[in-house]
């Protein structure tokens, strides 16, 4: 696709995973492609096989080591290549000099739990997963609450501009089912983006006490 449009986008999860998506207009679904990673200052290199995720889009994960191992630093540069099989040879389709800490996308927060729930408020906590110690406290969060009769897209975003792994939701309706999600983003990196949303946490507020003014 010489005149078509292609896109090669990769993100580092800050520990031991680089996730990549390669898309190309007009490419055949059964095309066999790989991503090769060559760091500039490490002894290892890594390959993953791109697998189709849509009509003209492929994805794979470069697993660099144990999930919590710190495989790259802010000074590392990894040359990433997309290679696709053409007959008997591999053809380089795309090359990127990848700066891991300029292209961050963390794993979704995990272990969401209700710490305390009342009629009108609920305190929820969570944990971050596989996040580098380099960030120290330089992280921010976004949270959203799904109310009955609404969609996630309609839910207002609550922004936490610091590393705060809990939230107190207020002005809730008694005896009502809600769902809650949170995502995380490092402050570092020109091309850094939000993590995926966490798995939703379902909770129900306490009913109002009978005979009490609510």
């Amino acid at each position: 696709a010489v005149n078509g449009t292609s896109q090669f986008t990769c993100f580092y999860n800050s520990r031991a995973n680089i996730s990549c998506v390669w898309s190309q207009d007009g490419a055949l679904q059964d095309t066999s492609c790989q991503v090769h990673a060559w760091p500039d200052r490490r002894r290892w290199n890594q390959t993953c096989e791109l697998l189709p995720v849509s009509q003209a889009s492929w994805a794979c994960n470069l697993i660099l080591g144990a999930p919590d191992s710190q495989k790259l630093t802010t000074v590392d540069i990894v040359t990433l290549r997309v290679l696709c099989r053409e007959g008997v040879r591999w053809r380089v389709m795309a090359i990127q000099d990848f700066k891991p800490f300029e292209n961050l996308r963390l794993m979704a927060p995990i272990s969401l739990q209700v710490v305390h729930v009342e009629t009108h408020r609920c305190n929820i906590s969570w944990e971050i997963s596989q996040a580098s110690h380099y960030f120290e406290r330089h992280l921010e969060f976004e949270a959203r609450t799904l109310s009955p009769g609404h969609t996630w897209e309609e839910a207002p975003l609550l922004t936490l501009k610091q590393k705060q792994e809990w939230i107190c939701l207020e002005t809730l309706t008694p005896d009502t089912q809600y769902e809650f999600q949170v995502r995380v983003k490092p402050l570092q990196g020109e091309f850094t983006t939000w993590s995926p949303w966490s798995q939703p946490l379902a909770f129900r507020t306490k009913p109002a006490a009978l005979g009490k003014d609510t």
Epitope: V2, N3, T5, F8, T79, M93, A94, Q96, D97
Partner: nanobody, 123 residues
Framework: QVQLVESGGGLVQAGGSLRLSCAAA????????VGWFRRAPGKEREFVAA????????LYADSVKGRFTISRDNAKNTVYLQMSSLKPEDTALYYC????????????????WGQGTQVTVSS
């Protein structure tokens, strides 16, 4: 925003050599790798070669492999296309273009373009 200015084009005999230059300016230029494209009279614009700033990784069109060499001088923010063993079919307007992070052979993947420099190869 990235600005690109080509130079070095001209008239040359078949079998001769030329070196084109592409001076790049703009914010964080190392995030914008550079490619050379060409448009011959009455033809579509086609990919020639591309290079990344940091590792110096390169891509070439099959038609120029072994004859053309792309290189860069990071200190001068300049990319060069050394053209040897030139043929009349290399006659074209040569453009340099900057991509967003990734080099490919697709012209639609390049976001910033220079005005071009003319190369004419006589037989």
């Amino acid at each position: 925003q990235v600005q690109l200015v080509e130079s070095g084009g001209g008239l040359v005999q078949a079998g001769g050599s030329l070196r084109l230059s592409c001076a790049a300016a703009g914010r964080a230029i190392e995030n914008y790798p550079v490619g050379w494209f060409r448009r011959a009279p009455g033809k579509e614009r086609e990919f020639v070669a591309a290079i990344t700033w940091i590792s110096g990784s390169t891509l070439y069109a099959d038609s120029v492999k072994g004859r053309f060499t792309i290189s860069r001088d990071n200190a001068k923010n300049t990319v060069y296309l050394q053209m040897s063993s030139l043929k009349p079919e290399d006659t074209a307007l040569y453009y340099c273009a900057a991509a967003l992070k990734t080099i490919t052979r697709g012209q639609n993947d390049y976001s910033y373009w220079g005005q071009g420099t003319q190369v004419t190869v006589s037989s």
